[in-house]
Amino acid sequence: ARNGDHCPLGPGRCCRLHTVRASLEDLGWADWVLSPREVQVTMCIGACPSQFRAANMHAQIKTSLHRLKPDTVPAPCCVPASYNPMVLIQKTDTGVSLQTYDDLLAKDCHCI
Amino acid sequence: ARNGDHCPLGPGRCCRLHTVRASLEDLGWADWVLSPREVQVTMCIGACPSQFRAANMHAQIKTSLHRLKPDTVPAPCCVPASYNPMVLIQKTDTGVSLQTYDDLLAKDCHCI
């Protein structure tokens, strides 16, 4: 269930997709990836206020218990709901090859 | 990939399964759930230091970018990797029914 998509904290403050530009060096990939030399990493960043984009029943429970016991139970967290695949050109023992990674770039986000 | 299960922050400090006892009132369920009257909610709580239980490539990227840009990119977050189903006895318009929820109790945890 994609509960409330309205962010009560103000525009852009709640859980959503962000793009962060990163070099191979930033990612620690320079020794095994040849291309791309820079990655536009899409990731999920932002707050998860009550019922905002609650992924499932567990997220709703977490919201309730966080309200009751904030020192014990953390608020739900903004994480990928799905991913976009991406191809990397990489060095291997046998030479250069293509590898597609299905879990590299966030496609959309929810709170859990 | 379940990277490192050794917690560098000390025993029990990193992402793992916790059990939190909650009443129907705590959960806001008193008006529609009859049983159980108390739920042992299993949830994922704890820190996600570098590569600890990294769920996938995205989590590894997030760790690297958090190290570089801690104010922009949050650390990976401890969330359920899978769930245990749970049955609730609930009130309906037509009486009482059983309903199994597949996404209510965390079964195990990872960092993403």
Partner: antibody
Framework: QVTLKESGPGILQPSQTLSLTCSFS??????????VGWIRQPSGKGLEWLAN???????YYNSALKSRLTLSKDTSNNQVFLKISSVDTADTATYFC??????????WGQGTLVTIS | QIVLTQSPAIMSASLGEEITLTCSAS?????MHWYQQKSGTSPKVLIY???NLASGVPSRFSGSGSGTFYSLTISSVEAEDAADYYC?????????FGGGTKLEIK
């Protein structure tokens, strides 16, 4: 296993529009960094890059031919299409499509011969 | 556009000989690929990004260079190496290929 196969009319007359199809399998144009490129080769001559179409629908054309080229794709059916308008005998060549990963023609089709006469 | 000039246009080599094919760019490029095309077949990549051997390519092939000058070396020519060899740049659009070097085996 990645495979690509070009199909075209074989023969057509000057001034007509050449329509080529590249049907591929083993990869998806939904994958970031993935594209399909077209290259041609007149008999006994070298390779000439024509155009690329990318996962995000960006298109790049050889500037010398840009006004005559049109690229499109059908991602769900794993097909890419190239049209070349107003052909003449200089367009006689074997036309290849190739899988492009970022900057690399990684896999090529067998090519289809097109004769303008 | 960046023009790539390959030399020689035709090279004849004996089995076991070491040979070097060159590719000169009209302006500086960051990297160069090399493709091999045997008669009647489609091209396949040999060298990726100047010096990286593609998967499955024999180690007798190697690449080097920078700026405007790149080369492909075959340390010990074998009969199966008879083919056309093309350099390719993608540093700027339009992507371009060199005119090719035909390698014949004596």
């Amino acid at each position: 296993q990645v495979t690509l196969k070009e199909s075209g009319p074989g023969i057509l007359q000057p001034s007509q529009t050449l329509s080529l199809t590249c049907s591929f399998s083993g990869f998806s144009l939904n994958t970031h960094g993935m594209g399909v490129g077209w290259i041609r080769q007149p008999s006994g001559k070298g390779l000439e890059w024509l155009a690329n179409i990318w996962w995000n629908d960006d298109k790049y054309y050889n500037s010398a031919l840009k006004s005559r080229l049109t690229l499109s794709k059908d991602t769900s059916n794993n097909q890419v299409f190239l049209k070349i308008s107003s052909v003449d005998t200089a367009d006689t060549a074997t036309y290849f499509c190739a899988q492009v990963a970022w900057d690399w023609f990684a896999y090529w089709g067998q090519g289809t011969l097109v004769t303008i006469s | 556009q960046i023009v790539l000039t390959q030399s020689p246009a035709i090279m004849s080599a004996s089995l076991g000989e070491e040979i070097t094919l060159t590719c000169s760019a009209s302006s500086s490029v960051r990297y160069m690929h090399w493709y091999q095309q045997k008669s009647g077949t489609s091209p396949k990549v040999l060298i990726y990004s100047t010096s990286n051997l593609a998967s499955g390519v024999p180690s007798r092939f190697s690449g080097s260079g920078s700026g405007t000058f790149y080369s492909l070396t075959i340390s010990s020519v074998e009969a199966e190496d008879a083919a056309d060899y093309y350099c390719h740049q993608w540093s700027s659009y339009p992507w371009t290929f060199g005119g090719g070097t035909k390698l014949e085996i004596k």
